[in-house]
Structures are given as C-alpha cells and as structure tokens.
C-alpha cells in the first residue's frame, strides 16, 4: 500500500464541544433541506479498496472539496452554524496540507471523483446533502486522522 | 471465507476478570473495526466499542469507558475484549462484528462466546 | 441518546407479507440497519442503508424509510424465516451504537 506521511491530526480538534454541537446542528438544518435520502455521499462505497493507513488522505480530499466548492459558495445559508463551522473545518484542511501519499493514489482519487459527480450531478440538492452529511464528514475525519 | 472465530464459553466469579478473543480470517485485518457487542435477556443489545486493528486506536461507549479494554495481535489477526471486576449482570452473549467505517453496519459477526458471572 | 422502538412481536401467515417497524426520535439524517438473529445463533445482517440489501439477502427483504419510521418488509414469508429482527443506528453526536429492543416474528 502507499505510504502515507503527515495525515495525522491531534485528537483536541474533536474534543471540543461547542464547535463539535455546532457542525452536529449544521448538518442536522441541512437534512431537513435535503429531500434525496436515497443517495449517500459518505459511505461504503468511499471507502471501498481505501486502506486504513489511506483513509485520512482519501478524508482530506473530501473535506477539500466539501469546503471550496460546498461550504464556500452556500456559506450564506445555515446561519449561524455555516459562519463558525467553515473556519473550523478550514483549519482542519490547513492542518492536513502536508498530508500526501507516496505511491499510486488512483484509486482514492476515483473514490473521491464519484463523490464529487454525485454533487454536481444533483446540484444544489447534491451540496446541500454534502452540508447534510458534515456529521458523517467530521466522524470519518476523526476516526482516519487521530 | 470470511469469518471471525470467537473463544469459548466462560463461567466466572464476581469480581474475576475475563478476556474474550476473535480471530479474523478471509479479508485484510487492518482493513475493518472490530466491535464488541454484548447481548443480554433484560438488556438486549448493547454496543461496547471498537478496536482500530491498524493503529490499536479504541474507542468505547460512555457506560465502558474506564472498564472495558480492546486490544489486538496483528501478527495472528485477533482482537481482544477484556472485562476486569465482573459483576452478575454481565453475564451476556460477547458478540465480535467488524465494520468498515467505525459507524458502519456490522457485516459479520463473530459466533458469540457465553459468559456466565456466577457465586 | 437515541432511542429505537420496535414492536415486540408480529406474526405472520406463510406466503404472506411481514411489515416490521423501527420508530427513533431525530432520525433524519442517520442511517437504519437491520439484522437478523435466529434462535442459538449471531445475528446477520439483512438490510443496511435504510434500503441496501447485502449480497447473498433474498429479494424477498426490503427495507423503507419514512420521516422517523423504518420498515423492514419480508414478502412471501417462509417458516425459515421465523426469528428475531433488530434495528440499528449510529447516534454520531453521542458517539453511541444503538439497537432496538428486537421484534420476534412468527410465522402461523
């Protein structure tokens, strides 16, 4: 398997409850918006062929492209949550800039893709389920990357 | 075929500590959570918590923590729950199940091992 | 805390169609699985994903979701179908694996 090098973040960033009950509300407003249930985003299938010592690396592309082209352009909606949960998930992305995979990546980087068509396939629909989903987004950040 | 192998029954005094095995086989064992479950007539199921196989990283439901202790052996594939200070109401079923995420659906499961916490 | 409701019991005629039930308090965005467990046995799994059947799963189980309801349906019940049925969900703030209290199903 390739290696990955610096795909590690302290447990503190999921240790802390007010930003943790607001990313948990945020996505909790956006589900009520989200009217697709039969489509998931984060799921099995992302994590299908992915190693464990991968998945970190396969979560920070996720979380890259859930905030540059999700959170970022519908950032005026959800209030108050979406205003303290971006930069917290910013941070987050910033803290796994370094994180790389030595070796062939190709097939995270498929895993990631059809996430992404999904979204943009459904449109708004499909960033407002990704908005839905950030529980499931924070979960899978904290258990590949502590 | 993939399976996990559970030890067997055990019958335990109050107080006494017990360490329930699960031998993984048929898949990449670093590759999947593996949980423990107890099941008990008044109770039903109970979720206890996982073991992370690759890094040994757990984490436990809040009614465990500080008591319960998952462990694993990568070089035979077999992960360990380990209940110190038995108490008659933990005579249960320990059920062993993996998941791919840690939040998951249990795809397998383990056959069960009785543990029985009698004077 | 989640909590999940099933119905003790629900019986069923050979042939006909078993409707079981799984009710859960803020169960919008968490994901329902079902599992069965027959006598002396582990539990499998059934139905994952609200509606995701695994492989080797006849036809036969599907499974639903409505606002905060859960369904598991089994058509054409058969004798071997006769056990107990679970509902499951990950409360994810609570960082909690959760069951239902189980429905036995009978077949008449």
């Known amino acids: 398997a390739p290696i990955s090098s610096h795909c590690r973040l302290d447990k503190s960033n999921f240790q802390q409850p007010y930003i943790t009950n607001r990313t948990f509300m945020l996505a909790k407003e956006a589900s009520l918006a989200d009217n697709n249930t039969d489509v998931r985003l984060i799921g099995e299938k992302l994590f299908h062929g992915v190693s464990m010592s991968e998945r970190c690396y396969l979560m920070k592309q996720v979380l890259n492209f859930t905030l540059e082209e999700v959170l970022f352009p519908q950032s005026d909606r959800f209030q108050p949550y979406m205003q303290e949960v971006v930069p917290f998930l910013a941070r987050l992305s910033n803290r796994l800039s370094t994180c790389h995979i030595e070796g062939d990546d190709l097939h995270i980087q498929r895993n990631v893709q059809k996430l992404k068509d999904t979204v943009k396939k459904l449109g708004e629909s499909g960033e407002i389920k990704a908005i839905g989903e950030l529980d499931l987004l924070f979960m899978s950040l904290r258990n590949a990357c502590i | 075929e993939v399976q996990l192998v559970q030890s067997g029954a055990e019958v335990k005094k109050p107080g006494a500590s017990v360490k329930v095995s699960c031998q993984a086989s048929g898949y990449t064992f670093s590759d999947y959570y593996i949980h423990w479950v107890r099941q008990t007539p008044g109770q039903g199921f109970e979720w206890m918590g996982w073991?992370?196989?690759?890094?040994?990283?757990?984490r436990y439901a809040q009614k465990f923590q500080g008591w319960v202790t998952m462990t694993r052996d990568m070089s035979n594939t077999t992960a360990y729950m380990e209940l110190p200070r038995l108490r008659d109401d933990d005579t249960a079923v320990y059920y062993c199940?993996?998941?791919?995420?840690?939040?998951?659906?249990?795809?397998?499961w383990g056959q069960g091992t009785l543990v029985t916490v009698s004077s | 805390q989640s909590v999940l409701t099933q119905p003790p019991s629900v019986s069923v005629a050979p042939g006909k169609t078993a409707t079981i039930t799984c009710g859960g308090n803020n169960f919008r965005n968490k994901r329902v699985h079902w599992y069965q467990q027959r006598p002396g046995q582990a539990p499998v799994l059934v139905i994952y994903y609200d509606s995701d059947r695994p492989s080797g799963i006849p036809e036969r189980f599907s499974g639903s979701r409505s606002g905060n309801t859960a369904t598991l349906t089994i058509s054409r019940v058969e004798a071997g179908d006769e056990a107990d049925f679970y509902c499951q969900v990950w409360d994810l703030f609570n960082d909690n694996g959760v069951f239902g209290g189980g429905t036995k199903l009978t077949v008449l």
């Open positions: 199940a993996r998941d791919l995420t840690g939040f998951d659906p249990f795809d397998i």
């Open positions: 073991v992370n196989p690759d890094t040994g990283g757990t």
